[in-house]
Structure formats: C-alpha cells, structure tokens
C-alpha cells in the first residue's frame, strides 16, 4: 500500500503517462520531487 515513487520507468511508461495517473497530493509531490532529482543526474525517491 505504501509506495515510494520509482527510480526508473516501467515498461511502456512515460513521464506523461505517469503524470496522467496521479491522484493524491502526495502522488504529485513525489512526482515533482522525482523530476527535480532526475534533473540533477539521478533518480530521487
């Protein structure tokens, strides 16, 4: 049930496809935190 945002994309997933499935405020927070970490050269939980 309790799930960290992934470090890497699963098969056939894009950032856009994940963005379209986010539901909670926490989901969006983790997603944008992940994006920020990705810009820095590595995925972030």
């Amino acid at each position: 049930k309790h799930k960290c945002f992934r470090n890497s994309l699963e098969n056939n997933e894009t950032l856009e496809s994940i963005m379209n499935t986010l539901e909670s405020e926490e989901d969006f927070r983790k997603y944008f935190y992940y994006l920020e970490g990705s810009k820095g050269g590595g995925g972030s939980k």
Epitope: K1, H2, K3, M19, N20, T21, L22, E23, S24, E25, E26, D27, F28
Partner: antibody, heavy 119, light 107 residues
Framework: QVQLVQSGGGVVQPGRSLRLSCAAS????????MHWVRQAPGKGLEWVAV????????HYSDSVKGRFTISRDDSKNTLYLQMNSLRAEDTAVYYC????????????WGQGTLVTVSS | DIQMTQSPSSLSASVGDRVTITCRAS??????LAWFQQKPGKAPKSLIY???SLQSGVPSKFSGSGSGTDFTLTISSLQPEDFATYYC?????????FGGGTKVEIK
C-alpha cells in the same frame, strides 16, 4: 473517523440527467483522489470514474465516457457525479470510494445510492 | 484493459472449512491486487491490499498471496459472518477492473 455519505439517487427516465453527491468527513478530502464505482442489480462491481487531487486528472470507463462528469468541491468536502443521457443499463447502486493515491487500494467506501433508469 | 477472472463463481462450504478463491489477471499486475467482501445490500469492505497485506481491523483468518497474474484469497476457518460475495480488483492501471465475484454459501 472517515465517513463518505452519499445522496442524490432516485428514479429517472431514459435520456434524463441526475447528479450524485458524496460528502466526506474525517480526513483531508482535498488531498486525495476520489472514485465512483457502480453495481448493477445482481451483478458485479464496475469502476466508473476517478478525479485527482485538485481535479488535475479525470478518467472514465468507456461505458460512461462523454455522458458522465466527475467533479469535486473541496470547500464543501463533496464529490459529485453528473450523469447525463442516462440509459437503462446505467441502473445500479453507485458507490464513492477513497484511496490513498496512485496504485493504492480502496480503504473506504460510501454506503451506496441507487439509480434506477426506467420509463 | 486488464481482465480479472475469478473462480469459482460460487461455492458451498461449512463452518470451519478452509476456503480458497483464485483470481487471474490477463496481464501482469505486480502485486497491485485487492480483495473485498460484500454482503447483500451493503457496500464492499476492503480486506486485503498489495495482494497479501491485511487492511486494518481485518481478522487474520483472511490471507492473500500471489504476484504477477495469479492470486489467491484464503479464509482459514470459515465463520457464519464470512458467508458473502468476494471480489478481487486490480489497481495497476486504468481502467481499474474487478473480478466477477465469488459467492460463498452455506452448505
């Protein structure tokens, strides 16, 4: 404690409209996505729609797409399902349901409200 | 869409019996599977999430297992209050889909 209290069901003629409501309490409603699930008489459960936090994302089942609209009013802690162009096959008990987020299971359900579409 | 196939669709059992219900997904869903119990005229009740984790307040006689495409719900010792219909649901991707249900009846 978490409560989801539904209202708005009833009998309606084919082609007409109806709006269901789901009043939430006991949790931070505005922070979570909310779902509608329905169950036709004597049948199984069918997912209908979801609305995300802030209404950013909305998704619908193919069976209701273009006819039903999911919305929320965070100032009233209330979820809505606007049902237009109703058909006999939309007759069902409609449930609202909460989950913690993307890829989480439902943890709370409303009590259900019956919608009967009949002439 | 991911199809969820539940079996059996109904079963008869006695109090004290061990009951197993299976659910198969048409494609892999990791462990994003939930089980619900529903009694006539009532809303579904969440039993298990993540294929094997018990929801808060659910007795330990319920257990779930599986990953990928094949899953099971087991009731270790059936009690009178357990006679109900049970549904599995995948929440790996939209549209979220449910199994057809398994009605557990008194033998």
């Amino acid at each position: 404690q978490v409560q989801l209290v539904q209202s708005g069901g009833g009998v309606v003629q084919p082609g007409r409209s109806l709006r269901l409501s789901c009043a939430a309490s006991g949790f931070s409603f505005s922070s979570f996505g909310m779902h509608w699930v329905r169950q036709a008489p004597g049948k199984g459960l069918e997912w209908v729609a979801v609305i995300s936090y802030g209404g950013i994302n909305k998704h619908y089942s193919d069976s209701v797409k273009g006819r039903f609209t999911i919305s929320r009013d965070d100032s009233k802690n209330t979820l809505y399902l606007q049902m237009n162009s109703l058909r006999a096959e939309d007759t069902a008990v409609y449930y609202c349901a909460k989950r913690e987020g993307y890829r989480y299971a439902y943890d709370y359900w409303g009590q259900g409200t019956l919608v009967t579409v009949s002439s | 869409d991911i199809q969820m196939t539940q079996s059996p669709s109904s079963l008869s059992a006695s109090v004290g019996d061990r009951v197993t219900i299976t659910c198969r997904a048409s494609q892999g869903i990791s462990n994003y599977l939930a089980w619900f119990q529903q009694k006539p005229g009532k809303a579904p009740k969440s039993l298990i999430y993540g294929a094997s984790s018990l929801q808060s307040g659910v007795p330990s006689k319920f257990s779930g297992s599986g990953s990928g495409t094949d899953f099971t719900l087991t009731i270790s010792s059936l009690q009178p209050e357990d006679f109900a219909t049970y549904y599995c649901q995948q929440y790996n991707s939209y549209p979220l889909t449910f199994g057809g249900g398994t009605k557990v009846e008194i033998k």
